[in-house]
């Protein structure tokens, strides 16, 4: 691509940098953990780590005073805040996809096993529609490891 064709990418990048997608992550994790609860699994068994916010001092999280509430009491609140954030990407499907990819990347280390990963991915794909937004047609949610070095 010509380098100045990337300008749209940078405007999307600007939005992604400023977006607080943590409510989306919280909403989805609560959702899949509630599903597991209904199948008799305890998401808070000692073998599993509870959610801990990512260590980024520049990203304060006003929504998350504690780990995921397993009763799901705050889930609708998280979903509303999540939808408000995703609404910013409504008219740019490629950017919406990148937002979903970022959510997947942020949570990939916290998902236990292939089954939970697939379930998270499935819920993530449905997230825009849950918010009454258009879902991106083609959006690869496979997690790449790290960035690309250039020396």
């Amino acid at each position: 691509r010509q380098q100045w064709e990337l300008q749209g990418d940078r405007r999307c990048q600007s939005q992604l940098e400023r977006a607080n997608l943590r409510p989306c992550e919280q909403h989805l994790m609560q959702k899949i953990q509630r599903d597991e609860d209904s199948y008799g699994r305890d998401p808070y068994s000692p073998s599993q780590d509870p959610y801990s916010p990512s260590q980024d001092p520049d990203r304060r999280d006003p929504y998350s005073p504690s780990p995921y509430d397993r009763r799901g009491a705050g889930s609708s609140q998280h979903q509303e805040r999540c939808c408000n954030e995703l609404n910013e990407f409504e008219n740019n499907q490629r950017c919406m996809c990148e937002a979903l990819q970022q959510i997947m990347e942020n949570q990939s280390d916290r998902l236990q096993g292939r089954q939970q990963e697939q379930q998270f991915k499935r819920e993530l794909r449905n997230l825009p529609q849950q918010c009454g937004l258009r879902a991106p047609q083609r959006c690869d949610l496979e997690v790449e490891s790290g960035g690309r070095d250039r020396y």
Partner: antibody
């Protein structure tokens, strides 16, 4: 963002300035490079995205600047070649498309 | 292009700095204007005050306000404080090259 120390170079030489990021996920944000000659305004040189591998340079610096990075040590680099006296300036790296965080600056002096 | 090049305002008074972009910085897909305002105090690195033309960066006092549309933008300091003495720059980041304005030097009258 912590930048490397001051450099003194001769005309025609190259300089490589480093910018070490910490406290956030390096691949999440773009890095820009901006320079400022003494008593002058800010001049945008270009940008790099460590996640996508993309870079873009201002026309003025084309063929003379290379922006690179090492994700494993969360460090960005800006190399400027064929230095001339008018390249004497403070060089800043900045985080994010809108430059929300700035390095402390690296003074590059070009003098014979 | 920024105007004026320099500005002297009394303490407690309003200061207004203008910035004109050569092209629109509005992204119609998200209705955001990709223009930022920076403050640089003598001997210091620049600091982001406003992004997306009107969104205040966290920690920036609410006396700083960004406004404007299309190609004409304004930074307003509602009540000038002594610590506001600095050079102010606008920057468009709608499309590369992400050019800065030439700067406006703000002093106390």
């Amino acid at each position: 963002l912590v930048q490397s120390g001051a450099e003194v170079k001769k005309p025609g030489a190259s300089v490589k300035v480093s910018c070490k990021a910490s406290g956030y996920t390096f691949t999440r944000y773009d890095i820009n490079w901006v320079r400022q000659a003494t008593g002058q305004g800010l001049e945008w040189m270009g940008w790099m995205n460590p996640k996508s591998g993309e870079t873009g340079y201002a026309q003025k610096f084309h063929g003379r600047v290379i922006m690179s990075w090492n994700t494993s040590i969360s460090t960005a680099y800006m190399e400027l070649s064929s230095l001339r006296s008018e390249d004497t300036a403070v060089y800043y790296c900045t985080r994010g498309v809108d430059s929300g965080v700035w390095g402390q600056g690296t003074t590059v002096t070009v003098s014979s | 292009t920024q105007s004026p090049d320099s500005l002297a305002v009394s303490l407690g008074e309003r200061a207004t700095i203008n910035c004109k972009s050569s092209q629109s910085v509005l992204d119609s897909s998200n209705n955001k204007k990709f223009l930022a305002w920076f403050q640089q105090k003598p001997g210091q690195r620049p600091k982001l005050l406003i992004y997306w033309a009107s969104t205040r960066e966290s920690g920036v006092p609410d006396r700083f306000t960004g406004s404007g549309s299309g190609t004409d933008f304004t930074l307003t300091i509602s009540s000038l404080q002594a610590e506001d003495v600095a050079v102010y720059y606008c920057q468009q980041y709608y499309s590369p090259p992400h050019t800065f304005g030439q700067g406006t030097k703000l002093e106390i009258k």
